[in-house]
Each structure stands twice: as C-alpha cells, then as structure tokens.
C-alpha cells in the first residue's frame, strides 16, 4: 500500500439484473487495472418503501470520489439509485447512507447486504 | 503503450460471414473485458458485444443477437467476431476497444477500426 | 435497453469558449456515464468517465458532472484541437448505449 492506502483486489460482488447482463448473481470479483490507477469496490442499491434491494456491487475504477474511503457511503439526499464507494478489499460488504444535510444525528444506520428475493 | 489492432474486414455479399480479429499488445490482456463497436457510414456509435476477462460472460446487442458471436483467445492476446447471415445494415467499421470491469465498460482505447461493406 | 438523448446535436463555438453538452438516461444510471471524442476518420477517444472522472492523458479543461438521469460534458475554455464529435455512453446495463453525438464546430 502507498502511505498506507488500503489496496483493493477484490470486492463483494452482485448483480440484480444478473440475467439479463449475462452474469453471475453473486460472488467475489477480482479488481483489474493499470498499475498506476487506484481500484475501488462500489454498492449501488434502491429503497423501495424502506426495503432495501441491491443493484449492484463490485469493483470500481480510479474514481477521486472513491479516494481514501475505508467505508462505503452514500452521502447524496435522496437519489433515486444509491451509490457509494470505497477502497479496501471487500469494503462493499456494508454500505451505509448518510445525507449530508444540515442535522448532527445520522439518519440511517449501516446496512448489511441481503439479496433480493426472487421467485 | 496499449495498442489494438483489427483486421478481417473487407466486402462480402449478403448472407455471407466474415470473421474479425483484434490483436491486443502493450497491456494484460487476460484481465480486461474487450467489445466491439460499430460505426455504420455517417452515423453514430452502437454497441455490439462485449467479452469478460476470461470468456465467462458475452452480450450481444439485439441487432446482432443470434448472428455474431465474440470470442477471446488469451493465450494469443486476440479477440475475435465472427459474424454470420451478414445484412446491408451490417455495414460499417467495426472498433475493438478495451473495457474495465465487465459491469462498468467504459472503453478507455479503441483500434483504428476495419471497414465491413456488405453488398451484393 | 437506456436510450441516452443528447442535446444539442450540434453547435458552433470559437476558441476561449465554454461549451456545455449535455446527455439525458430513460432512467436512472446512476454514475455509469461516459464521455467520447471523435474526429473525422478516427476512432473514438474517451474523455471522462464514471460520470466525472477524467481519462488519462485528458486535458483538465474538460469536466463531467451530473448523475441519475441528467449529465453534463463541459470544456471550459475550446481549444483548436476541441472540435470533434462528443458521445456519452452508458454502462449501468447490457446493451451499452450510445447518445446520438454533439458536433462541435468552428464558429
């Protein structure tokens, strides 16, 4: 690691639409990429009437957004899809959504990943 | 330096097949998905498959769906596109290009492109 | 399949300008977008992706911003070697699909 930046090999990952992209639905996946880029692994999820439902999860590619983030939080208000990223194998793992809004209190807790029922 | 390098283009009647190659060097190969990418003359760009790193996972754009087929040879550094029942609106250059992880392609080099003219 | 809209389809500029294009999903993509530079008898080179991040080798002049549905490609100050043809693409699913382009000309 450089200055003791965490390096990502390896992310949680998962995939909703797993049929249609022609993927697995759930695994580990290995993070490629040129050596002088940073790796990142990502969650992007919905809540639908406070139900949480993964979209997404996996690795990300040298993202500023993503920089130096041990945890994965999404800090948009509201968005329609929530995305967060981080840096550290497996770091997706737990996701979390945190508003940047003028308040003190954290309005959610972390959330730990279960996937979607399917019939 | 990454390079990529297509060829197998040429004109062929409708109907007929063409098989496109894309020579990959300057980078590994074995760990980036790979894509090919048309551009009919005069017009925009439109997906046409794409490939994993090691072959697990293909998709196809519907147009293509059932007709083309991509394919990988890691130990060669090469990517292939066999295209099959070929149409007039098949025409274009075709690109190869580099993707990053196969959920999130953006494609960061693409070949200088080969020109596939289907007519009779 | 994500039809991505781009507007406008074209516009003319002069050196030192600041363009905006712009790219709209059918649906959200989250930050799954991409910006391509295109020149006459070339292939494609990409210019920003994950909706803000800039590509390698690009000149910081240009910027990306936006996600879910709206996205922007701004190049704050054209320069000669600018005037091209500018996709966005998206990679939140299979197909990916490209906007119509934006030609960028000389005023």
């Known amino acids: 690691a450089i200055l003791g930046r965490s390096e990502t090999q390896e992310c949680l990952f998962f995939n909703a639409n797993w049929e249609k992209d022609r993927t697995n639905q759930t695994g580990v996946e290995p993070c490629y990429g040129d050596k002088d880029k940073r790796r990142h692994c990502f969650a992007t999820w919905k809540n639908i009437s406070g139900s949480i439902e993964i979209v997404k999860q996996g690795c990300w590619l040298d993202d500023i957004n993503c920089y130096d983030r041990t945890d994965c939080v999404e800090k948009k208000d509201s968005p329609e899809v929530y995305f967060c990223c981080c840096e550290g194998n497996m770091c997706n793992e737990k996701f979390s959504y945190f508003p940047e809004m003028e308040v003190t209190q954290p309005t959610s807790n972390p959330v730990t990943p279960k996937p979607p029922y399917y019939n | 330096e990454v390079q990529l390098l297509e060829s197998g283009g040429g004109l062929v009647q409708p109907g007929g097949s063409l098989r496109l190659s894309c020579a990959a060097s300057?980078?590994?190969?074995?760990?980036?998905?790979m894509n090919w990418v048309r551009q009919a003359p005069g017009k925009g760009l439109e997906w046409v498959a794409g490939?994993?790193?090691?072959?697990?996972?293909?998709g196809y754009a519907d147009s293509v769906k059932g007709r083309f087929t991509i394919s990988r040879d890691n130990s060669k550094n090469t990517l292939y596109l066999q295209m099959n029942s070929l149409r007039a609106e098949d025409t274009a250059v075709y690109y190869c290009a580099r993707g990053a992880n196969w959920h999130d392609t953006h494609l960061d080099y693409w070949g200088q492109g080969t020109l596939v003219t289907v007519s009779s | 399949d994500i039809q991505m809209t781009q507007s406008p389809s074209s516009l003319s500029a002069s050196v030192g300008d600041r363009v905006t294009i712009t790219c709209r999903a059918s649906q959200s993509i989250v930050r799954y977008l991409n910006w391509y530079q295109q020149k006459p008898g070339k292939a494609p080179k990409l210019v920003i992706y994950a909706a803000t991040s800039l590509a390698s080798g690009v000149p910081s002049r240009f910027s990306g911003s936006g996600s879910g549905t709206d996205f922007t490609l701004t190049i704050s100050s054209l320069q000669p070697e600018d005037f091209a043809t500018y996709y966005c693409q998206q990679s939140y699913e299979l197909p990916l699909t490209f906007g119509g382009g934006t030609k960028v000309e000389i005023k």
């Open positions: 300057g980078f590994t190969f074995s760990s980036y998905s």
């Open positions: 490939i994993n790193y090691n072959g697990g996972y293909k």
